[in-house]
């Protein structure tokens, strides 16, 4: 009381910090600085994120939230989780479509586009691997299918129809002789 | 919008007193620690008070700690700077400024005059 | 006491012209710093708090920068209404202290 000297940072709990004139406790996550604490070890005046925007941390310099983020419909993104005071909007994408990154060493955050799902059912192939973080993997063909080129061919239903020997091993063909 | 607006201010013999107002409004008065700021004529500015927002932390330079004494009233939004034992070289122009870090925000100012 | 040693204490400059105005503390206050501008019989406004944000409303060719002891406020291009004293002063610790302010004027 009465003196000159700005006291030292002696506050009980770990979260005060200098911040101006006075060792300040901050801001909570989804709150920005309005304006420091006014005397030692005080409460800062903290303010919730306005909509659409946000922070995730506890800080006690942020005198303004960041702006959340849209999903790039371009790229046929989607909000999986709507941003929130305390957390940004987190984009992917929609059920039968994969995250293709747009950079090689791919990150949380990198730039990315949503492709869709290889459809192995409409291909006439098992499916090996479910599309999520990558596109879906194909298998061997499906029964009543063989092999041919890079795709599945329709065993014969007739005599008329030629069968090779792929086609002959799968669809048993010659057995019907 | 913000306003400061300092009264109280006017002439007066060495040793006398004066007690100098701040009227504080659009803003929320008691979130906001507050300062008192003088001028000397054609002189520089210099830090004389400041009152935390509760009013339980006050602190006064050495030139004026002891004569002057910085209060508030948080119900009535105003801060207050009492003057005693005046000296001729505490005439200037008296500015209340509210604390956010910075002081963002200035009153006009108030004069005074300490002269026999 | 913080002594805040403000350079030069006069200026004067012509409209269009940058101009640099230097702030040194006696020791360091991190960026806890600002900028004041005061016109002839009115009251000092803020122009820049924390050595470089430039408050809300005040035009973007005025800037600050430094941190620890050295600052610097810059004016890119010299506007006849610029024509003011400009006053830095240091928060990191009380007492308060003020430069002594950089008149300056239009050549």
């Known amino acids: 009381q009465g003196g000159t000297r700005s006291p030292r940072c002696d506050c009980a709990g770990d979260f005060h910090k200098k911040i101006g004139l006075f060792c300040c406790r901050g801001c909570p996550a989804g709150h920005y600085l309005k304006a420091p604490c006014t005397e030692p070890c005080g409460n800062s005046t903290c303010l919730v994120c306005p909509q659409d925007t946000f922070l995730a941390w506890e800080n006690h310099h942020n005198s303004e939230c960041a702006r959340c983020q849209a999903c790039d419909e371009q790229a046929s993104q989607v909000a999986l989780e709507n941003c929130s005071a305390v957390a940004d909007t987190r984009c992917g994408c929609k059920p039968g479509w994969f995250v293709e990154c747009q950079v090689s060493q791919c990150v949380s955050s990198s730039p990315f586009y949503c492709q869709p799902c290889l459809d192995c059912g409409a291909l006439h192939r098992h499916t090996r691997l479910l599309c999520s973080r990558r596109d879906t993997d194909c298998g061997t063909c499906l029964p009543g299918f063989y092999e041919h080129g890079d795709g599945c061919v329709s065993c014969p239903t007739s005599t008329l129809g030629s069968c090779p020997e792929r086609c002959a091993a799968v669809c048993g063909w010659r057995q019907m002789f | 919008e913000v306003q400061l607006v300092e009264s109280g201010g006017g002439s007066v013999q060495p040793g006398g007193s004066l007690r100098l107002s701040c009227a504080a409004s659009?803003?929320?008065?008691?979130?906001?620690?507050m300062s008192w700021v003088r001028q000397a004529p054609g002189k520089g500015l210099e830090w004389i008070s400041y009152?935390?927002?509760?009013?339980?932390?006050?602190y006064y330079a050495d030139s004026v700690k002891g004569r002057f004494t910085i209060s508030r009233d948080n119900a009535k939004n105003s801060l207050y700077l009492q003057m005693n034992s005046l000296r001729a070289e505490d005439t200037a122009v008296y500015y209340c400024a509210r604390y956010s870090g910075a002081f963002d925000r200035w009153g006009q100012g108030t004069p005074v005059t300490v002269s026999s | 006491d913080i002594v805040m040693t403000q350079s030069p204490s006069s200026l004067s400059a012509s409209v269009g012209d940058r101009v640099t105005i230097t702030c040194q503390a006696s020791q360091d206050i991190s960026n806890y710093l600002s900028w004041y501008q005061q016109k002839p019989g009115k009251a000092p406004k803020l122009l820049i708090s924390d050595a470089s944000n430039l408050e809300t409303g005040v035009p973007s060719r005025f800037s600050g920068s430094g941190s620890g002891t050295d600052f610097t406020f810059t004016i890119s291009s010299l506007q006849p209404e610029d024509i003011a004293t400009y006053y830095c002063?240091?928060?990191?610790?009380?007492?308060?202290?003020f430069g002594q302010g950089t008149r300056l004027e239009i050549k």
């Open positions: 659009g803003f929320t008065f008691s979130s906001y620690g």
């Open positions: 009152i935390s927002s509760s009013g339980g932390h006050t």
């Open positions: 002063q240091q928060y990191d610790n009380l007492p308060i202290t």
